[in-house]
Amino acid sequence: NKILVKQSPMLVAYDNAVNLSCKYSYNLFSREFRASLHKGLDSAVEVCVVYGNYSQQLQVYSKTGFNCDGKLGNESVTFYLQNLYVNQTDIYFCKIEVMYPPPYLDNEKSNGTIIHVKGKHLCPSPLFPGPSKP
């Protein structure tokens, strides 16, 4: 038995931040689980991890330097990524493992979400026009 995951096919991070919602075919209420977001076609980089526990607040962390937060719904986990760089444009995959109560369940690999990070266009300010040509 596998959990199915739905993700938006593409998201654009205009302000270097994005909300990626992972929607599961499984109710996470009163379960202990580990939800994670992975970067790259091979899912080699674990961007963010959310530990859910029936008795505690969500534990959210990144061991790979991403600025992330997480929010839990009954059948979803939303990852909020901030301070993204243009070169972090990539495909991102949601993963879920439900540990307790047994049995252990994980997900079928999703189609992923392409996150396109748009660079900030820094226009010269009229108050500080920069050096003028002679």
């Epitope: 202990e32 540990m99 307790y100 047994p102 049995p103």
Partner: antibody, heavy 120, light 111 residues
């Protein structure tokens, strides 16, 4: 035949660290369906769960030990490891690794155990 | 944490006796009709051995004189006719929630 063999026990100084190994045979640590836990038993006392690792590599730890413990594995050697830091006398115990299946998480195979004594 | 309390802590019995050990959980360990409560036997200097899983299922290779029953918070391990090799310590364990916990043990001694 499923087998688990622990090693690495012995005498350790208080404040020191231990790294125990659990060599698995008869099944793969990275194949779905089974996981492995570390469990300890102080002399003359009951059983205490330390933590578990799943085929995916995800880990779960006892809250009382979480800050001092790391469970890891080497898939190429099909071996599990337990690292426990800042050791104290009350960590003296026989340390077991035990396999569980994903349906009920009952420990169906156990290693023989390895004794760790924390003393100066 | 889910506390498991076994009773009695120890008992003396003779070969052929019927022995009953109880395990009470501080909260239900049932989920969708399955009780995540297991029983182990441990002999001195040896690792524990799984006897019963999911409250009442007999582990492969375990003699049929061992049986388990119960649901929710109250569970029982029964040895229908005690044999010499059954003198040991028995533990219950729950796998419903982390941290996984064990009962304190029941030592079965020769009368």
């Amino acid at each position: 035949e499923v087998q688990l063999v622990e090693s690495g026990g012995g005498l350790v100084q208080p404040g020191g660290s231990l790294r125990l190994s659990c060599a698995a045979s008869g099944f793969s640590l990275s194949t779905g369906g089974v996981g492995v836990s570390w469990i300890r038993q102080a002399p003359g006392k009951g059983l205490e769960w330390i933590g578990s690792i799943y085929h995916s590599g995800s880990t779960y730890y006892s809250p009382s030990l979480k800050s001092r413990v790391t469970i890891s594995r080497d898939n190429s050697k099909n071996t599990l490891y337990l690292q426990l830091n800042s050791l104290r006398a009350e960590d003296t115990a026989v340390y077991y690794c035990a396999r569980y299946e994903y349906d009920y998480y009952a420990f169906d195979y156990w290693g023989q155990g390895t004794l760790v004594t924390v003393s100066s | 944490d889910i506390q498991l309390t076994q009773s009695p802590s120890s008992l003396s019995a003779s070969v052929g006796d019927r022995v009953t050990i109880t395990c009470r959980a501080s909260q239900s360990v049932d989920f969708y009709g399955i009780s995540f409560l297991h029983w182990y036997q441990q002999k001195p200097g040896k690792a524990p051995k799984l006897l019963i899983y999911a409250a009442s299922s007999l582990e492969s290779g375990v003699p049929s004189r061992f049986s388990g029953s119960g649901s929710g918070t109250d569970f029982t391990l029964t040895i229908s006719s005690l044999q010499p090799e059954d003198f040991a310590t028995y533990y219950c364990q729950q796998s419903y929630r982390t941290p996984l916990t064990f009962g304190q043990g029941t030592k079965v001694e020769i009368k």
